[in-house]
């Protein structure tokens, strides 16, 4: 049988002569030479090698155990005359023993991570791994140790796990955002003689909402005319915030001062500045200077952070208003006059009153728009604004006239205003009252007294402030021995009558009957107006069958001031 | 005076690429985000995407409709804007406008005359 | 995503008509985010209301903007021959978004 234990073997041999790996041998071999021991299999004739007769083998190459950490091979002994097997073939290994001969390597060369800024100690950073290739069953030769050659004291590796945390209270990242950790691994357990590896950690302190706004000034001062619209930009104020991104947005707002309702502030979505604004239109004359007391706050804190104080600082800002020249303004919107018809050229009407708002209160001059006023009929006193009439009125023929009048600086003739003047012309008695319209009518042959023949109507251009009046009558020179008579309804109104029974045609085929209307205003206006009445021949319904061709032409009356 | 112009407009394939330029002159370019609206013929108006300025990043937002497709690029130094557009679609057919907004960085007050895309095989 | 709508989306309006247009967003919006635009055909949109109330410069002032939160409202008290056009609401919080429009006509 064959006499031979496992072989073992160092790996990494240095030795000058092959390595001696150990003996094969039958105890059927009496050293006689009669045998012959032969090897194959793993790395036979290559890297081992036999001594055919003695059955010592030998490595003749220089092993590494990380490479390959078992050889397999078979032996065989076999009678050198006959050829045949002493000893069945048999399988035998070589294990290669472990030297410390590789040093730990990281998974990576660099890391990087990130932690955010005052974190508390012992916060997790980021993990690194070493693997070393020397057999971990055997020894400490693969037994990694972790520490930290560089990053102290602001960090910390757990030596078995190479887990990196923080081993700093407060770390700012406006202080100092970047480390550059070096990490070892050693193996050996970390022992002398032990083999080390070193890997870069890239650390990143992320940003924390830890800092307030801050304003730069505790004052600032703008300047904007009065005429600025509201929404118009006058200023830009920054505060600074040492965080970024999220924790640096600020928020702006006006908390106080006189100026709260006439101001308002933005923030610059982009920049962050504040932007001071016009809300309401303003005014020089009514205020020269509003004070705002403006904060600027983080929209978004961590309230963890609320010990270091309020996230928000105030600053005051005066804005001065400057003076734009403005035209004239009217005491009125509008002015509303009036005016009796029957007044005489330069009667006074009335009055504009308009004034400079400036400070400076630059004396106006007043004119009439002639535009508004083409036949001149108005005029206007340049200086103190008073408006009479350079033409006679007729109400009849207007009675409303709009003009504009115009103010203007005396300085500045570039600065004027307009202002509607609606001028209403007040009625006075000056028209007569006459017909409605021209009357012909006819009386039939058989018509019996008192008959209604024609009711008459009148109108007057007048506008009496009581209503028309009219009275109607027969003109004295017509009224005795009249065929007809008038009669006043008292209602603006009058009938003619018949006074007789009958008429003739053939005797008198038209009659004229002048009648005086008049109204009941002062001074009483009248007129004379005809009344043409012809006789005809009517059927037994009094529908008129025929009448005499021709009238009498006689005049119809003129009007009279009674 | 504010003047936003835009130029590379023109006819593309389904599945092409173009890219549109918008320069700008009459105001601080470097302190205004940057807007590329668009409008398809006879519709209303849809927002393209916006790029912000260098303090923030140029970071770059995006409609849903052309996300991963257009790409805007600002160069501050040339005072100009800029949208790539790639895989072009039928849909993406509009005239496309460059957009300033106002001061403080709201609304959309300064708009360019448009330049058309038209997207047809 | 903050929807807009406006209402109505068409309307038929003389000259001296007082109209009001109206926005409504999906969720409550700061009044300095919400802005107005007029659009003529062919023309690119021009800024008409910013910050909800403040009037663009140049713009009449027949024109108003109001509200807060989730309603607001744009205003021409006598409308003029050259105010006929489509008018749009638009909210800043990205993504923006628009309004579908209000197209309004001469009657």
């Known amino acids: 049988s064959w006499m031979w234990n496992q072989f073992f073997l160092l790996e990494e041999y240095t030795g000058s002569d092959y390595q001696y790996v150990g003996k094969l041998h039958s105890d059927q071999d009496r050293g006689d030479g009669s045998l012959k021991y032969i090897l194959s299999g793993d790395g036979a004739g290559d890297l081992f090698i036999i001594n055919e007769n003695t059955g010592d083998i030998q490595a003749t190459k220089r092993l590494d155990r990380e490479e390959k950490p078992v050889y397999i091979l078979r032996a065989q002994a076999i009678n050198r005359r006959t050829g045949r097997p002493v000893e069945p073939e048999s399988e035998f290994i070589i294990k290669i023993h472990d030297i410390n001969d590789n040093e730990p390597i990281f998974t990576k060369e660099v890391y990087t991570a990130t932690v955010p800024e005052m974190s508390d100690v012992g916060t997790f950073v980021v993990q690194v791994t070493a693997t070393d290739a020397d057999d971990p069953t055997y020894g400490n030769s693969a037994k990694v140790v972790y520490s930290i050659l560089q990053g102290q004291p602001y960090f910390s590796v757990e030596s078995e796990t190479g887990i990196i945390k923080t081993a700093l209270l407060n770390m700012d990242r406006e202080n100092r955002e970047q480390y550059q950790v070096v990490i070892q691994a050693k193996d050996m357990g970390g022992q002398m003689g032990g083999l080390s590896g070193t890997t870069t950690v890239n650390i990143t302190l992320t940003d924390v909402n830890d800092n307030p706004p801050r304003f730069p000034q505790s004052t600032y001062q703008f300047k904007t005319p009065e005429s600025s619209p509201p929404g118009t930009p006058i200023g830009r104020i920054k505060a600074s915030d040492a965080d970024v991104g999220e924790n640096a947005e600020i928020e702006y707002s006006i908390t106080d001062g006189e100026g709260l309702d006439m101001f308002d502030v933005i923030t610059d979505q982009e920049t962050q500045e504040g932007i001071i604004t016009v809300k309401k239109l303003l005014d020089f004359e009514k205020k020269k200077v509003y004070t705002l007391k403006v904060e600027a706050s983080n929209p978004y804190v961590e309230p963890r952070f609320l010990y270091l104080g309020p996230f928000k600082d105030s600053a005051t800002v005066r804005i001065v208003v400057e003076d734009v020249d403005e035209p004239p303004v009217f005491s009125k919107l509008a002015y509303i006059l009036q005016i009796r018809e029957d007044a005489q050229i330069n009667t006074t009407i009335g009055s504009v009153t308009a004034q400079d708002p400036d400070a400076a209160r630059n004396p106006v001059k007043y004119s009439v728009d002639r535009h508004t006023d083409m036949d001149r009929i108005f005029n206007i006193d340049s200086g103190n604004g008073s408006i009479f009439t350079s033409k006679l009125l007729d109400r009849e023929t207007l009675l409303w006239h709009n003009i504009t009048v115009i103010a203007t600086e005396i300085n500045n003739p570039k600065q004027s205003s307009r202002v509607p003047l609606y001028i209403k012309v007040l009625d006075v008695n000056d028209n007569a009252p006459e017909f409605a319209e021209f009357y012909e009518t006819f009386v039939c042959e058989k018509a019996k007294a008192d008959q209604l023949i024609q009711t008459l109507h009148a109108v007057d251009k007048d506008d009496p402030y009581s209503g028309h009046q009219f009275s109607f009558s027969l003109a004295p020179e017509a009224a005795s021995g009249s065929n007809f008579t008038i009669q006043d309804n008292k209602d603006n109104t009058a009938g003619i009558l018949t006074r007789k029974n009958g008429y003739n045609r053939h005797e008198m085929s038209t009659y004229l009957l002048p009648v005086v209307i008049s109204d009941n205003d002062y001074p009483v206006q009248s007129s004379t107006g005809t009344v043409t009445v012809r006789v005809c021949a009517c059927d037994h319904h009094g529908n008129m069958q025929s009448c005499h061709a021709e009238a009498l032409i006689h005049p119809t009356g003129l009007s009279t001031g009674a | 005076e504010v003047q936003l112009v835009e130029s590379g407009g023109g006819l593309v394939q389904p599945g092409g690429s173009l890219r549109l330029s918008c320069a700008a002159s009459?105001?601080?370019?470097?302190?205004?985000?940057m807007n590329w609206v668009r409008q398809a013929p006879g519709k209303g108006l849809e927002w393209v995407g916006r790029?912000?300025?260098?303090?923030?990043?140029?970071?770059?937002y995006y409609a849903d409709s052309v996300t991963d497709r257009f790409t805007i690029s600002r160069d501050d130094s040339k005072n100009s804007l800029y949208l790539q557009m790639n895989s072009l679609k039928t849909e993406d057919t509009a005239v496309y406008y460059c957009?300033?907004?106002?001061?403080?960085?709201?609304?959309?007050?300064?708009w360019g005359q448009g330049t058309l895309v038209t997207v047809s095989s | 995503d903050i929807q807009l709508t406006q209402s109505p989306s068409s309307l038929s309006a003389s000259v001296g008509d007082r109209v009001t247009i109206t926005c409504s967003a999906s969720s409550s919006i700061s009044s300095h985010y919400l802005h107005w635009y007029q659009q003529k055909p062919g023309k690119s949109p021009k800024l008409l209301i910013y910050?909800?109330?403040y009037l663009a410069s140049g713009v009449p002032s027949r024109f108003s903007g109001s509200g807060s939160g989730t309603d607001f409202t744009l205003t021409i008290s006598s409308l003029q021959p050259e105010d006929f056009a489509t008018y749009y609401c638009?909210?800043?919080?990205?993504?923006?978004?628009f309004g579908q429009g209000t197209k309004l006509e001469i009657k």
């Open positions: 790029i912000r300025i260098k303090n923030n990043n140029y970071a770059t």
């Open positions: 910050r909800s109330f």
């Open positions: 009459g105001f601080t370019f470097t302190t205004y985000a």
């Open positions: 638009q909210q800043d919080i990205v993504p923006l978004t």
């Open positions: 957009v300033r907004p106002d001061y403080g960085n709201y609304g959309l007050a300064y």
